[in-house]
């Protein structure tokens, strides 16, 4: 089956202190290799969250990607701040044998746009 | 069939104001996010603002931030842009511009209103 | 923001003839790019999305191509009504949503 990442939602407004998820499915799981979360693109991208195990403060996975044959690769920001505003990107990589992982597929990008919290 | 009408354009002095309207039809206004969109004379198309269907998340371009502001009224099915601070450079045909529902591309756009800004 | 720089500036050719345009991104935008049309006095269409997808209407004559950072709009035969300026835009690094300088395609 093609590969593709969906990111249903284009933008989410989510109120500063609360939390938010940021959709990700994939048709595919092949080629092997891991999926991860980054905010915005090119040299200035910062990682958000990767499914490969290690601890990121605030962002979780939705479901259990350790499922066999788990498509969603969703993730949850908790306690939002007006500083994660952005474009986040859901991207899939392919494992390489020696060298550094290849990108090789990407959602089209969930914009978060953080509201003042209600007083 | 879509619609988009605009309208308020005209010439103005450098440093005043001038309120721009899109009438749409054909669609579910409320379930669309709405742009505008601008061309200068002899120069190339410029993305100016955006804002969500349910007016809550909006972005503008770096050289009308501050300056312009976009908002709609889903009652009325009409899109407005408020340009304040008008500079010679605003000079353009001012497109107003729907989204489609899915990704940040153009499905219908309107036919365009001129804006000269001029001493 | 990602700049999209378009090529040629203008493209002379007869009707009948093959037109090749190229959209070029300063970083890669998947396949997350379109292709618009413009005539003077008229809105602009619509013509590709998604980098190869046609538009509703749009006649196969049009097609795109490329992934990436290199993209190409092709109009297999130029008729009468395809001499107009092409814009391609990419919706993957945004905000800011950018578009590409325009391609001019004139009658020789």
């Known amino acids: 089956k093609e590969l593709k990442v969906t990111q249903p939602e284009k933008s989410v407004s989510v109120a500063a202190g609360d939390s938010t998820v940021l959709n990700c499915t994939l048709t595919s799981l092949l080629p092997v290799g891991p999926i991860k979360w980054y905010r915005g693109v090119g040299q200035s991208r910062l990682l958000i969250y990767s499914f490969t195990g290690e601890h990121f403060p605030r962002v979780t996975n939705v479901s259990d990607a350790t499922k066999r044959n788990n498509m969603d690769f969703s993730i949850r920001i908790s306690n939002v701040t007006p500083e994660d505003a952005g474009t986040y990107y859901c991207v899939k990589f392919q494992k390489g044998p020696s060298e550094p992982d290849t990108e090789i597929q990407s959602g089209g990008g969930t914009e978060v746009y953080v509201l003042a919290k209600p007083s | 069939d879509v619609q988009l009408v605009e309208s308020g354009g005209g010439v103005v002095r450098p440093g005043e104001s001038l309120r721009l309207s899109c009438a749409a039809s054909g669609f579910t206004f409320s379930s669309y996010d709405m742009n505008w969109v601008r061309q200068a004379p002899g120069e190339g198309l410029e993305w100016v603002s955006l804002?969500?269907?349910?007016?809550?998340?909006?972005y503008y371009a770096d050289s009308v931030k501050g300056r312009f502001t976009i908002s709609r009224d889903n009652s009325k099915n009409t899109l407005y842009l408020q340009m304040n601070s008008l500079r010679a450079e605003d000079t353009a045909v001012y497109y107003c511009?729907?989204?489609?529902?899915?990704?940040?591309?153009?499905?219908?756009w309107g036919l365009g209103t001129l804006v000269t800004v001029s001493s | 923001e990602t700049v999209l720089t378009q090529s040629p500036g203008t493209l002379t050719l007869s009707p009948g003839e093959r037109a090749t345009l190229t959209c070029r991104a300063s970083q890669s935008v998947y396949t997350y790019l379109a292709w618009y049309q413009e005539k003077p006095g008229q809105a602009p269409r619509l013509l590709i999305y998604?980098?190869?997808s046609r538009a509703t209407g749009i006649p196969d004559r049009f097609s795109g191509s490329g992934s990436g950072t290199v993209f190409t709009l092709t109009i297999s035969s130029l008729q009468s009504e395809d001499f107009a300026v092409y814009y391609c835009?990419?919706?993957?690094?945004?905000?800011?949503?950018?578009f590409g300088g325009g391609t001019k395609v004139e009658i020789k």
């Open positions: 804002i969500s269907g349910s007016g809550e998340i909006i």
């Open positions: 511009a729907k989204e489609n529902n899915r990704y940040r591309f153009f499905d219908d």
């Open positions: 998604g980098a190869s």
């Open positions: 835009q990419q919706y993957y690094d945004r905000p800011p949503l950018t």
